[in-house]
């Protein structure tokens, strides 16, 4: 810890300015008033302090606000934010989206640090839910943010927030997360017309049930193979050859290239070879002609 030493004559800081970069650490400690620093935090960012000098400034703020910094200070932390520990941040009460944006800007272009994760957690908990503006902000800085949340956390996302989600924000989501997000997206986009609806819902379809896929197959949507390959296997299996043909439209040709991969592989195994042959794509592995198809799920339900 920096030793308490008297400020040399004439060195007492009257404002936060560039002259302070020439102060030694002990001089900063002795000559900069914490209250002055707190009121002029917005100037710190414009001054090229060394990391050691920033450590001193942080120490002064910690002494002034042992229970946690006020938002007026937090909003102007700038690069000093990088000096904060998750423990420091847990003491904060951040309610302004502008404050959140300002701090995320400091960390822009880097992976989400433990500090940022703690800040976001504090902010979202303070708001009570992940509203549209917050989601918009977070996904702009961290496209993978949504997929870093647990299904339980995602359940607090209101459907209205789904409008802020871009396709790339869902790239790393797993099926359990999409299971939670899909019904919200369906609700959010329910008043859109067919083609516009499909464009919006497409990224969320990894959580769609069979009934919805069947409904989409009647709407001339031309789902691409990349989207089809991300569908839940259990949702694809009950689809008929005709339904898959309608769902994919001109992309049905792509099934051949994917016939060894899930869910196409598993779907093929459930279809009659006769029906697969009607596609003219040479898909192999269907149920041979004359074989009886037992619906085991129905059998279980009856027994």
């Amino acid at each position: 810890e920096v030793e308490k030493t008297a400020c040399p004559s004439g060195k007492k800081a009257r404002e936060i300015d560039e002259s302070l970069i020439f102060y030694k650490k002990w001089e900063l400690e002795a000559c900069v008033d914490a209250a002055l620093l707190a009121t002029q935090m917005d100037r710190v960012n414009a001054i090229p302090f060394t990391y050691e000098q920033l450590d001193v400034l942080k120490h002064k703020l910690d002494e002034l606000y042992p229970q946690g910094y006020p938002e007026s200070v937090i909003q102007h932390l700038g690069y000093l934010f990088l000096k904060m520990s998750p423990e420091d941040i847990r003491k904060w009460n951040v309610t302004s989206l502008e404050t959140l944006k300002a701090l995320l800007e400091v960390n822009k272009g880097h992976e989400m640090s433990p500090q940022v994760a703690t800040l976001i957690d504090r902010f979202v908990k303070g708001r009570g839910q992940l509203d549209k503006d917050t989601l918009d902000t977070l996904t702009a800085f961290y496209p993978g943010y949504l997929c870093s949340l647990s299904p339980e956390e995602l359940s607090s996302v209101p459907p209205s927030s789904i409008w802020a989600v871009r396709p790339q924000d869902l790239d790393t989501c797993d099926p359990r997360q999409l299971d939670v997000l899909y019904p919200k997206a369906r609700l959010a986009f329910q008043n859109m017309n067919g083609s516009e609806y499909f464009v919006k819902i497409q990224s969320f379809l990894g959580g769609a049930p069979t009934e919805d896929l069947k409904a989409l197959s009647q709407q001339n949507v031309s789902m691409d193979l990349a989207t089809f390959m991300k569908l839940r296997t259990d949702a694809v299996l009950p689809l008929t050859v005709a339904e898959v043909q309608k769902l994919l439209g001109p992309h049905v040709e792509g099934l051949k290239a994917e016939e060894r991969h899930r869910p196409v592989r598993d779907w093929i195994l459930r279809q009659r070879q006769d029906d697969l042959d009607t596609l003219g794509l040479g898909l192999q592995g269907g149920i041979p002609n004359g074989y009886l198809v037992l619906d085991l799920s129905m059998q279980e339900a009856l027994s």
Epitope: S222, D224, P250, E253, K256, L276, L279, G280, G282, L283
Partner: antibody
Amino acid sequence: EVQLVESGGGLVQPGGSLRLSCAATGFTFSSYWMHWVRQGPGKGLVWVSRINSDGTSTVYADSVKGRFTISRDNAKNTLYLQMNSLRAEDTAVYYCARGRGIMTYWGQGTLVTVSS
Amino acid sequence: DIQMTQSPSSLSASVGDRVTITCRASQDIGSWLTWYQRKPEKAPKSLIYAASSLQSGVPSRFSGSGSGTDFTLTISSLQPEDFATYYCQQYKSYPLTFGQGAKLEIK
């Protein structure tokens, strides 16, 4: 390796007949739709006809309807095009091709010349 | 029948160039369009299907775009082996129809 080899082309007089064959190897022939496509001298590609995998459904271009017949023998892995009432404008290299609406594999073609 | 019109019918370019060929359908064909590459004495090769989906094994410098009536084939950086004739073809309805072809030559 998928291979399609056309044969049966040659010189024929207007009004005459010719039967083209396309021998398929390297894939399950009976599962695929097949097509005939032609290209006249100095011209572009023109689709002629299509047959489904089991031979129960055929489609023709208007220019050959009633004169040409597409057929297949899945036991012999062979596609056929029976061409009757041939005209000078039927002169072209004829290709057989595998696929649905998209022809992913083609043969090297066989030349049909209709001339007196 | 659906008419397919390609432009330009021929073009000259150099290795490394970005090249664009367009194809117009006489009526709405959605995304039911494919592009072929044809080299002399060789069978046509399918490059793109469903207007924008790359056939497996085709280099990523080839891309397709468009829907409805206007479509584009783009080669982002021409390679020596790309000099050929390119055809578009609709498979929305029978009879299947091709564009007249666009011959890409070395400048």
